[in-house]
Structures are given as structure tokens and as C-alpha cells.
């Protein structure tokens, strides 16, 4: 970087190398070049010569002033015009940064995804800081008073094997960067209350041609949790509003849920579950598409990526989709 160049003088920043975005700052350049009384001193930002707000302080030093500096990063260097030198002589360079102190982390959430072996803690970091910001997650046992700390740049996965202090914990997050430090409120958790069941997955759909055609959605989860509550939401792809059906589920066998849908319309389905009575839900499952036939029965299975139609009783067709903006993986 620019900081590794051999200097013939100094370049420095007031009040500091990293500063709050939007501040007025001064950059100073002091030449110390043998046999050179600089005629002129020049400043460059990201390789472009600055032409305004430069003041010569004395024979060897000049100052560049920036009002309301808003760039997250800039490489600064300065040069001197020496008599009898054809080119400008490099004095020194420095990388400068501007940003914000961290906001107070909020919405601290810790969950254990079934079978993961980890407790995953996330939080809302607030506004972008533009500079390197680290987070320390504090986990304190309410039974043993023992506290563990985990350093991270975003979220954290903590092995459940390392949580040896019983079931009840306090969790809080400290955010820190070069410009400041903030601490979240404390979250009290019980390990048994934060387990999210293994993901529920829609495997196929089938429309049965009865007097009133009905669509059966087949879905399942590998969870070992006995009492699970689930929601399935569905809508025509042309609609904005979801319809939601609730289920108390026992996953000892594949679930079959019946829907009476309009013919010849493409629908999208998603499912999510939680341990009954607990706080956190799974994220919604991947989008599952199914188009109802006009009169012909149809099966949709996860195996194919395009619609195919056939006059037979059960016909495979599209199934999978991807997460979209109305399909956020919320766990709250």
C-alpha cells in the first residue's frame, strides 16, 4: 500500500488517521528532501492532484483542508517541486479512512438449529460503519456465573458442547471499532426454548380430479421433536397476499395437506415450523410451485425445473424455486 513507500518527509492527519465521516480534516505535508527547498508542495488523493484549500505554512510544510470529508477510504500522498528537478519528488503517503462508531447492537437472537450442534447468535448491527468493526458476544451462565466471550465480525456459531454451565444463560453483544464502542441489552435464554426443528420441506403436490378438485401437498421434516406447530402459506403467483394454514404436526410420517384451489392457476407454497409453544420459527422453506390443471389431474414433484403436461393421472412437473424478497429467512 501507500504506507510502504520510502518517505522524504512526513504526511499526517488532524485529528487522526481514521475519523468520523463528515468531519472537517487537515492533512499536513512536511518535506525533508536533501538539497531541496520546495518551490511548491502538492497533494494527491487517490492519484488525483488537489487544487484547492492548500495553504503553505512555512518553507517545508503545507496543509490541505477538507470540509465534510465523506469518503470511506482515500490514499493520500504529497510531492515537492524542487529546483533543478525535472519531476516532482515524492515526500510521503498515507491511507486515511472515515466512518462511524457502531450503533448499539439490538434484536439479539440466539437459536439452536436441530442437529447443528451449534447455538447461532445474530443481531441487528445498525448503520454501516464503513470501517473494520468487531463484535464480542458474551455468554454468561446464570447457574455457574461463568462467562465466555467470542470475537466475530458478524454472527457467531457457538458449539453447544462448550455450553457446560447448565441451560440458562445471559447473552449480550459488544460492538467496537476505532471510533467507538457500544453494548446491547442482555438477552436471557434457556437452551431448551430456542431449538428450531429440522427444516420442513415440501416434496410434491398432487391435484385429484374429484367433484371438487383438491390439491394435496406432501411435506416432511427429519425432526425428532414430538410437538411441532407448522404454518403453510400459499398464494397465486399473481397475488400479493398469502393465505396461511396452521397445523399441529407429528412427523412420524409424511404430512399431507389438502387445499381447494382455483383451476389453471400457478400457486406457490412455503412451510415453516416451530416447537409448539416456543418462540422461534424456522425460516420459510424454498418456494414450491404448483399449477392446478384445467380439468386434468396433475402431480408436481421436486425433481424437475420446467412444466410438463400430460393427460395421464399423475404427471411430474416443476417444483422448486428460490428465495425471493417476500420469502425472507426470518426466525423471529
Amino acid at each position: 500500500g501507500i504506507t510502504n513507500i520510502n518517505c522524504s518527509g512526513h504526511i499526517w492527519v488532524e485529528p487522526a488517521t481514521i475519523f468520523k465521516m463528515g468531519m472537517n480534516i487537515s492533512i499536513y505535508c512536511q518535506a525533508a528532501i536533501k538539497n531541496c527547498q520546495p518551490r511548491k508542495l502538492h497533494f494527491y488523493k487517490n492519484g488525483i492532484k488537489e487544487r484547492f484549500q492548500i495553504t503553505r505554512i512555512n518553507k517545508t510544510t503545507a496543509r490541505l483542508w477538507y470540509k465534510n470529508f465523506l469518503e470511506p477510504h482515500a490514499s493520500m500522498y504529497c510531492t515537492a517541486e524542487c529546483p533543478k528537478h525535472f519531476q516532482e519528488t515524492l515526500i510521503c503517503g498515507k491511507d486515511i479512512s472515515s466512518g462511524y462508531p457502531p450503533d448499539i447492537p439490538d434484536e439479539v437472537t440466539c437459536v439452536i438449529y436441530e442437529y447443528s450442534g451449534n447455538m447461532t447468535c445474530t443481531w441487528n448491527a445498525g448503520k454501516l460503519t464503513y470501517i473494520d468493526t468487531k463484535y464480542v458476544v458474551h455468554v454468561k451462565s446464570l447457574e455457574t456465573e461463568e462467562e465466555q466471550q467470542y470475537l466475530t465480525s458478524s454472527y457467531i456459531n457457538i458449539s453447544t458442547d462448550s455450553l457446560q454451565g447448565g441451560k440458562k444463560y445471559l447473552v449480550w453483544v459488544q460492538a467496537a471499532n476505532a471510533l467507538g464502542m457500544e453494548e446491547s441489552k442482555q438477552l436471557q435464554i434457556h437452551l431448551d426454548d430456542i431449538v428450531i426443528p429440522s427444516a420442513a420441506v415440501i416434496s410434491r403436490a398432487e391435484t385429484i380430479n374429484a367433484t371438487v378438485p383438491k390439491t394435496i401437498i406432501y411435506w416432511d421434516s427429519q425432526t425428532t421433536i414430538e410437538k411441532v406447530s407448522c404454518e403453510m402459506r400459499y398464494k397465486a403467483t399473481t397475488n400479493q397476499t398469502w393465505n396461511v394454514k396452521e397445523f399441529d404436526t407429528n412427523f412420524t410420517y409424511v404430512q399431507q395437506s389438502e387445499f381447494y384451489l382455483e383451476p389453471n392457476i400457478k400457486y406457490v407454497f412455503q412451510v415453516r415450523c416451530q416447537e409448539t409453544g416456543k418462540r422461534y420459527w424456522q425460516p420459510w422453506s424454498s418456494l414450491f410451485f404448483h399449477k392446478t390443471p384445467e380439468t386434468v389431474p396433475q402431480v408436481t414433484s421436486k425433481a424437475f425445473q420446467h412444466d410438463t403436461w400430460n393427460s395421464g393421472l399423475t404427471v411430474a412437473s416443476i417444483s422448486t424455486g428460490h428465495l425471493t424478497s417476500d420469502n425472507r429467512g426470518d426466525i423471529g
Epitope: 492527519v13 488532524e14 472537517n24
Partner: antibody, heavy 117, light 107 residues
Framework: QVQLVQSGAEVKKPGSSVKVSCKAS????????ISWVRQAPGQGLEWMGW????????NYAQKFQGRVTITADESTSTAYMELSSLRSEDTAVYYC??????????WGQGTLVTVSS | DIQMTQSPSSLSASVGDRVTITCRAS??????LNWYQQKPGKAPKLLIY???SLQSGVPSRFSGSGSGTDFTLTISSLQPEDFATYYC?????????FGQGTKVEIK
């Protein structure tokens, strides 16, 4: 040779304010910044804030935000630090220091502020 | 905020000894580190700026090194006038912060 000369010692009551001055000579006052640093008895050094004399730009430590005001008067080459809502833990020697080469190269002699009821 | 941690907090040495004081920053500060000497009842005095540059008028027995998070002040041959408290200070970001100080005492 740059010199920074500070005002004399002060004794103040809790809740009151103090204003310490720092007069510069022997250099171009407007060419540099001035910081204020304090030192409680037997303790280390603590930076309070900075002012760019020519531009009037200030930057304060969060700990003192709202209680400290740093100003500069170019015509008299003097910087000022005012600390309000004084409490006993503000008893300290207060120094002004010149910013140069991203360091404090010249310091005032210090002003003892005693906060006592 | 960047925390500066000095070690040791105090040391006893004899005239002529080589003395080393270390300063660690809680995060990388490049070369934006300064060293000061303070004697009782006096203002601090700048010794080293930008991690390794000797301030004008400071004896050459003082030297500084390091970058990133770990820095060292070395006095190659301790003199009677060097018994004092030494502080490191980062100028990388505001708030500008100092180490807690290292007191160099006569053995």
C-alpha cells in the same frame, strides 16, 4: 521556539464550570491544532478533545461530549477549554498540547483544577 | 475506542542498563504511535513520533520500533535523567488514547 502558557490554578465547587486558557507564542497559531489532555492525581493521561485553530473544527472524546467546549481565538493566539457540571473526579491537571506530526510536540505547563465543596 | 496496554507498569533498572518498554494496541494502528516521557510535576515530553522517528533534541539512546499492534520503546543505556514515567499514545483514531504508563525507577 513554540511556547504554550496556561492560566493559573483554580478551585471550583461541584456543579460549576471552569475555563482554562492556553496562549501560544513562537509559532503560527493558525497552522496547527490544539488538544487538551488531563491527568488526575497519580493517574495517567486522558485526551479530552481537539480544535483546529484556523478552522474552528472540534472533536471531543465521547466521555466529555456535552460537558466540554474547546474554542480558539486566532487574534490572541489563545485556545480555551471549558468544562461544565464539575464533579470531584474532575480534579486534575489540565494540559494543552500542540498537534504536530500527529503527536503532541509542545505542551503547556499544566493548570491544576481542584473541585471541592 | 482503541485501548493501549503498556508493560511492565513499573521497572527497576540501573544506570547503563538497556531498558525496553512495550505497548500493545487493541487493534492495528499502523505506525501511528508516539512515546512521551513525564517527570513528576512536569508536562509530558515527546520522545518518538510515528513509531520510530526521534523527535528533534531527544538523545539517540531512545529508539522506537513496531507497527500494527505491537510497539517498543528502547533506552539503550539508561542515564540518571531518564528515571521517569513513559507513556505510549495512539494517533490513529479519536479518541486519542494513552497507555497507562511505565514507571522507570532506580534499582
Amino acid at each position: 521556539q513554540v511556547q504554550l502558557v496556561q492560566s493559573g490554578a483554580e478551585v471550583k465547587k461541584p456543579g460549576s464550570s471552569v475555563k482554562v486558557s492556553c496562549k501560544a507564542s513562537g509559532g503560527t497559531f493558525s497552522s496547527y491544532g490544539i488538544s487538551w489532555v488531563r491527568q488526575a492525581p497519580g493517574q495517567g493521561l486522558e485526551w479530552m478533545g481537539w480544535i483546529s485553530a484556523i478552522f474552528g473544527t472540534t472533536n471531543y472524546a465521547q466521555k466529555f461530549q456535552g460537558r466540554v467546549t474547546i474554542t480558539a481565538d486566532e487574534s490572541t493566539s489563545t485556545a480555551y477549554m471549558e468544562l461544565s457540571s464539575l464533579r470531584s473526579e474532575d480534579t486534575a491537571v489540565y494540559y494543552c498540547a500542540r498537534h504536530w506530526l500527529q503527536s503532541f510536540d509542545y505542551w503547556g505547563q499544566g493548570t491544576l483544577v481542584t473541585v471541592s465543596s | 475506542d482503541i485501548q493501549m496496554t503498556q508493560s511492565p507498569s513499573s521497572l527497576s533498572a540501573s544506570v547503563g542498563d538497556r531498558v525496553t518498554i512495550t505497548c500493545r494496541a487493541s487493534q492495528s494502528i499502523g505506525g501511528d504511535l508516539n512515546w512521551y516521557q513525564q517527570k513528576p510535576g512536569k508536562a509530558p515530553k515527546l520522545l518518538i513520533y510515528a513509531a520510530s522517528s526521534l523527535q528533534s533534541g531527544v538523545p539517540s539512546r531512545f529508539s522506537g520500533s513496531g507497527s500494527g499492534t505491537d510497539f517498543t520503546l528502547t533506552i539503550s543505556s539508561l542515564q540518571p535523567e531518564d528515571f521517569a514515567t513513559y507513556y505510549c499514545q495512539q494517533s490513529y483514531s479519536t479518541p486519542l488514547t494513552f497507555g497507562q504508563g511505565t514507571k522507570v525507577e532506580i534499582k
